[in-house]
């Protein structure tokens, strides 16, 4: 039903979902924290234009006893609940923030007439992709795919010089929500990835993933993964591996990796990590003191999401335009506003737009370098180094399948 | 419009130092490498190393790694090349020139002519 | 290091010709480079990965080729393109140049 929003008269209502089921385990506390940080920072925006109007926002706490997993993959009617309990006490905002569970929002976007913005830090899934009142501030999987595409099939880099079109994808179902999701998009038969690659086999079991570092016979030399280091070292040990397989770790809200005193350890070398540039000014910020490195992106997007509200509301009163019409709801992608650590960019459909960076692990100094750093916002690849130090022959990047002889002619434009 | 803007021609003696630089607009110096390469009289064209100005990695072709020294100054949007103990081999015109991968050194300063002579 | 051999290093010819230049690596690359220089001046991106014509270049030229040899043709010369063109290649780590073409007027 229609929920009249509290939306008018210089007071600006954000309704931000507190849900038991969350893309991080992050405390309520923090999230709150980061949303009033944001606050302040809009309200000072306002002011400085000359908006003399109210922001505030409402936390929406859901039912701890019915939703306590704190799993997104429990998490499908959790949101249509919360909904419901707005629409009960008539307490509509301008906008909603949260859920970030693709399961939950995609439930919500199905279910619901959505005349008013949705801010997700989440909804990593493909079935998130595309929604028209939807903005996503955390890398969707579509961003991560079309990187991958990307880099298997460039072969005109010096380190880089045979397009691959195989691969092994890594899955075992105990993954976090954006690792699930990254890899659920890499598995579907229908997706983009799929679509470009010749072969690619999910494997499931930890000893299906050791038997293939080793095996003569395997079908690529290029194992997806997705999680940090460590998760990494659980699997593979300290056992062997030929000298032709890259595994890519996929760990994209993981600051560590840049962090001075870093030393890679011996099972990163034949691994390349993709992660996201980092923020400069996040490490000292009153709301990201207590937060480690991996749980800061998911406080910041929260914090961003109330930004870029402020910046919506900013332009509409600016232009005299009202605030509660699909104009408004629809309006949320296409731009760059001023987020919490600088610019932040939207593509045509509400997604984030960012640096990813490819790092590989220096065999003369046992640091992670950067290799090349990919702009989601054009699909364009930025060389960094262009003779890394790497552990494999010659200083390149293998061939995806052994003993197929050169490739060279394989020209993607 | 992109522009790579180098520092005039100098004049050395055998042992001494030059800093070339190479000064950038029209475009985000940070986010493309920046390359040199050498030109001696009558000889081809020699690529001596490249730097990534948002990172700092350098790469340098070994028969130059001696010799040359890439730095940048990112406030300035300028990269230099120094050149050390300098020999009659090393009279040439030295360009910086920009990649815009996949098309490499897409753009090339005006060249700085170094000549060194005793 | 790759070594590039251009063919021929000097080329006499009247506007209007075809000419084809030529560019043959010591072991086999991707892709190959251009790039036009004319006396007192800095070279030009003209050609990028064998057969992409860098932004302002004439549809005259073309370029093509793979492993180890590879081919710059301009179908009809005019009076600007007298100039002397280079090869380079980026496949390994350093990237080398051809020694140039001098194509002169006849």
């Known amino acids: 039903s229609q929920v009249s929003q509290n939306c008018h008269n210089g007071s600006y209502e954000i309704s931000v979902l507190m849900m038991g089921n969350s893309a991080f385990a992050e405390p309520l506390k923090n999230l709150e924290d980061a949303v009033n940080e944001g606050l302040e920072i809009v309200r000072g925006r306002l002011q400085n234009a000359g908006l003399n109007v109210t922001v505030n926002a409402t936390f929406m706490y859901s039912d701890g006893l019915i939703h306590n997993s704190g799993d997104c993959r429990s998490s499908t009617c959790e949101g249509l609940d919360l909904l419901r309990k707005i629409s009960n006490a008539q307490r509509m905002g301008c906008v909603l923030i949260g859920p970030s569970c693709t399961y939950s929002t995609f439930q919500m976007y199905l279910d619901t007439e959505l005349s008013y913005p949705m801010i997700s830090a989440g909804s990593f899934g493909l079935s998130c992709d595309y929604k028209e009142t939807l903005t996503r501030l955390m890398s969707p999987a579509r961003k991560l795919m079309y990187f991958l595409v990307n880099f298997w099939k460039t072969n005109d880099l010096p380190f880089k010089t045979y397009s691959w079109s195989t691969s092994y994808v890594y899955k075992n179902g105990t993954e976090t929500e954006d690792c699930f999701w990254y890899l659920n998009a890499l598995e579907a038969s229908v997706s983009y990835f799929s679509h470009e690659l010749g072969f690619k086999v999910v494997l499931r079991q930890d000893k299906e993933f050791q038997d293939i570092l080793m095996d003569h016979n395997r079908k690529s030399n290029v194992i997806i993964m997705c999680g940090g280091p460590e998760f990494l070292y659980k699997l593979k040990g300290d056992r062997a591996v030929a000298e032709d397989i890259v595994i890519i770790l996929v760990d994209l809200f993981n600051d560590q990796y840049f962090e001075d005193n870093v030393t890679a350890p011996d099972y990163m070398k034949n691994v390349l990590v993709l992660t996201l540039s980092p923020g400069n000014s996040l490490l000292n910020s009153s709301f990201s003191r207590n937060l480690s490195p991996t749980k800061r992106d998911f406080a910041l997007a929260y914090l961003n999401g109330i930004l870029l509200f402020g910046h919506m509301l900013k332009i509409f009163l600016e232009n005299g335009e009202n605030i509660t019409t699909p104009k408004f709801a629809h309006a949320f992608r296409n731009l760059t506003f001023e987020g919490y650590d600088g610019p932040v960019t939207l593509d045509d459909w509400g997604d984030v737009d960012s640096t990813m960076v490819l790092l590989y692990t220096s065999v003369d100094t046992k640091k992670y370098k950067v290799l090349l750093t990919y702009d989601t916002h054009v699909n364009k690849t930025y060389p960094v180094d262009m003779s890394p130090t790497f552990t494999w022959k010659n200083s390149k990047l293998p061939n995806d399948i052994t003993g197929r002889g050169p490739q060279h002619h394989h020209h993607h434009h | 419009e992109v522009q790579l803007v180098q520092s005039g021609a100098e004049v050395k003696k055998p042992g001494a130092s030059v800093k070339v630089s190479c000064k950038a607009s029209?475009?985000?110096?940070?986010?493309?490498?920046m390359n040199w390469v050498k030109q001696a009289p009558g000889q081809r064209l020699e690529w001596m190393g490249v730097?990534?100005?948002?990172?700092?990695?350098?790469n340098y072709n070994q028969k130059f790694k001696d010799k040359a020294t890439i730095t940048r100054d990112t406030s300035a949007s300028t990269a230099y090349m120094e050149l050390s103990s300098l020999r009659s081999e090393d009279t040439a015109v030295y360009y910086c020139?920009?990649?815009?991968?996949?098309?490499?050194?897409?753009?090339w300063g005006q060249g700085t002519t170094v000549t060194v002579s005793s | 290091d790759i070594q590039l051999t251009q063919s021929p290093s000097f080329l006499s010819a009247s506007p209007g010709d075809r000419v084809t230049i030529t560019c043959s690596a010591s072991?086999?690359?991707?892709?190959m480079y251009w790039y036009q220089q004319k006396p007192g001046s800095s070279p030009k991106s003209w050609i990028y990965?064998?057969?992409n014509d860098a932004s302002g270049v004439p549809s005259r030229f073309s370029g093509s080729g793979s492993g180890t040899e590879y081919t710059l043709t301009i179908s009809s010369l005019q009076p600007e393109d007298f100039a002397t063109y280079y090869c380079?290649?980026?496949?390994?780590?350093?990237?080398?140049f051809g020694g140039g073409t001098k194509v002169e007027i006849k």
């Open positions: 020139a920009r990649d815009d991968y996949p098309n490499y050194f897409d753009y």
């Open positions: 029209g475009y985000t110096f940070t986010d493309h490498n």
């Open positions: 730097m990534n100005p948002k990172f700092g990695t350098i």
């Open positions: 072991s086999s690359v991707n892709y």
């Open positions: 990965r064998t057969s």
């Open positions: 380079q290649q980026y496949h390994d780590y350093p990237p080398t």
